[in-house]
Interface confidence: low
């Protein structure tokens, strides 16, 4: 006796290793989503003794947007935080097509690594759609193969060069929170840049070294944007 | 009340010894005193997962009893507002053994401050 394919759970996938009776399987929330505390991802193939038919138990799982991606974190003084409103999913998949009962693509809420440079943060965020890519992911504790898929990146950077556009989740508003300290630091940096400039006029040999060092730093004030920095994230915006 | 919570936790630990529950649960292993109520609520929520996945009546009853005891103890402290604490889903997922050990630690924290 075997079980049919398990039921679909919103924002989750399941990779069934065995359809046999008493097999216990786990759903895994899609990347960018996490299992809601208090809910179980477990489903078990059980036998209905009255009908002699095997079926999967209903998991109580609810996958919610990863709060680490949703929250507008308290930003360091030099940071301009860009955030958007997470929409309520109206249908089970953004394309309007409904997902199949089970899908072999299951990846854990991936631990995505990114080089975080001072003054800017890359925050992974994934819309409920499939076929997007992920920078790096780890296998789930249950041995489910992770899929190398695309992740959308939101740039939370102090650069105010954020290109206009709609976020993959459908965010149309961009809320920019600028702390007083940021304004002050902006002023100070302008003064320091001016000082550098004046200094460079007086001592040319040293200036070239110092200016190179300045340019090597990540764009913190949005004065001269390095294309490759924004390229990694702006194509999704 | 918190002492009874500890004994219920020990009972749950004993009961799950014979079971294979491979769940990983959101666990705060380093509770900051200013976030202990928030952390406790996460532990209580995740305890329900053990109950759900065990399918065992004794565990279910013990969990239910523990939650009632803990909630009573929390409410007797009055409404505590904690801010800047991690949400449950931001915590690390750990196996049941580590989860229960950390749970005992946080309960002891409440005992020490009550």
């Amino acid at each position: 006796i075997t079980c049919p394919p398990p039921m679909s759970v919103e924002h989750a996938d399941i990779w069934v290793k065995s359809y046999s009776l008493y097999s216990r399987e786990r759903y895994i929330c899609n990347s960018g989503f996490k299992r809601k505390a208090g809910t179980s991802s477990l489903t078990e193939c059980v036998l209905n003794k009255a009908t002699n038919v095997a079926h999967w138990t209903t998991p109580s799982l609810k996958c919610i947007r990863d709060p680490a991606l949703v929250h507008q974190r308290p930003a360091p003084p030099s940071t301009v935080t860009t955030a958007g409103v997470t929409p309520q999913p109206e249908s089970l998949s953004p394309s309007g097509k409904e997902p199949a009962a089970s899908s072999p693509s299951s990846n854990n809420t991936a631990a995505t690594t990114a080089a975080i440079v001072p003054g800017s943060q890359l925050m992974p965020s994934k819309s409920p759609s499939t076929g997007t890519t992920e920078i790096s992911s780890h296998e789930s504790s249950h041995g489910t193969p992770s899929q190398t898929t695309a992740k959308n990146w939101e740039l939370t950077a102090s650069a105010s060069h954020q290109p206009p556009g709609v976020y993959p989740q459908g965010h149309s508003d961009t809320t920019v929170a600028i702390s007083t300290s940021t304004v002050l630091l902006c002023g100070l940096s302008a003064v320091s840049l001016l000082a550098c400039y004046l200094k460079s006029r007086q001592t040319p040999p040293l200036a070239s070294v110092e200016m190179e060092a300045m340019e090597a730093l990540p764009v913190t004030w949005g004065t001269s944007s390095r294309d490759e920095d924004l390229e990694n994230c702006s194509h999704h915006l | 009340n918190w002492v009874n919570v500890i004994s219920d936790l020990k009972k749950i630990e004993d009961l799950i010894q014979s079971m294979h529950i491979d769940a990983t649960l959101y666990t705060e292993s380093d509770v900051h005193p200013s976030c202990k109520v928030t952390a406790m609520k996460c532990f209580l929520l995740e305890l329900q997962v053990i109950s759900l996945e065990s399918g065992d009546a004794s565990i279910h009853d013990t969990v239910e009893n523990l939650i009632i005891l803990a909630n009573n103890s929390l409410s007797s402290n009055g409404n505590v507002t904690e801010s800047g604490c991690k949400e449950c889903e931001e915590l690390e997922e750990k196996n049941i053994k580590e989860f229960l050990q950390s749970f005992v630690h946080i309960v002891q924290m409440f005992i020490n401050t009550s």
Epitope: P4, S8, V9, E10, P59, S91, A100, A101 | Q48, L52
Partner: antibody, heavy 118, light 107 residues
């Protein structure tokens, strides 16, 4: 045993407010959705909306959006359906039902008959 | 919004006969999201089939569900006296829609 027990029948006048309840037992209230379904006399079933008591995430059917309010009280494992101003057309049997996660309604309450008449 | 149309509106059969109830969706529905319910007079609905073909706990094996895409069927292989009731199909998921019902009556 999973049980959903609804409050008793109500007779109201148009314009009055009303809140009916659905008390659950036998499972963890916060981990399953609770839906509300209307059945007008001699008619079929109409889906009204659904709530996830764990975080009060509520979704309404477009036909009922703004007409009713769905809420839940975790402390007493009870879901509610309320009207601020009843109309004669609200006369119906109202059922609460447990939704397995985004799945069908596997357990139902016995129903609450609401009669609105002047 | 998906519209579910059930046919026939009323089906008159005798105990022992086979009943076939149809549910047609206005657009394709994943079979994972189709359920059938039975409702007897004065009672709450009862889940029979979910996922188009999976019997709910305690439902006799004379009830079976089939179909995919836009056409779904509930079959009662051999009618028992207690099977005469109204049957509803439902599309569930992030939006829930019921069909208008099929009344199964004794002829």
């Amino acid at each position: 045993e999973v049980q959903l027990v609804q409050s008793g029948a109500e007779v109201k006048k148009p314009g009055e407010s009303l809140k009916i309840s659905c008390k659950v037992s036998g499972y963890f209230f916060t981990t399953y959705w609770i839906g509300w379904v209307r059945q007008m006399p001699g008619k079929g079933l109409e889906y009204m909306g659904i709530i996830y008591p764990g975080d009060s995430d509520t979704r309404y059917s477009p036909s009922f959006q703004g007409q009713v309010t769905i809420s839940a009280d975790k402390s007493i494992s009870t879901a509610y359906l309320q009207w601020s101003s009843l109309k004669a057309s609200d006369t119906a049997m109202y059922y609460c039902a447990r939704g397995g996660n985004w799945n069908c309604f596997d357990y139902w309450g016995q129903g609450t008959l609401v009669t609105v008449s002047s | 919004e998906i519209v579910l149309t059930q046919s026939p509106g009323t089906l008159s059969l005798s105990p022992g006969e086979r009943a076939t109830l149809s549910c047609r969706a206005s657009q394709s529905v994943s079979s994972s999201y189709l359920a059938w319910y039975q409702q007897k007079p004065g009672q709450a609905p009862r889940l029979l089939i979910y996922g188009a073909s999976r019997r709910a706990t305690g439902i006799p094996d004379r009830f079976s569900g089939s179909g995919s895409g836009t056409d779904f069927t509930l079959t009662i292989s051999r009618l028992e006296p207690e099977d005469f009731a109204v049957y509803y199909c439902q599309r569930y998921g992030s939006s829930h829609t019921f069909g208008q019902g099929t009344k199964l009556e004794i002829s």
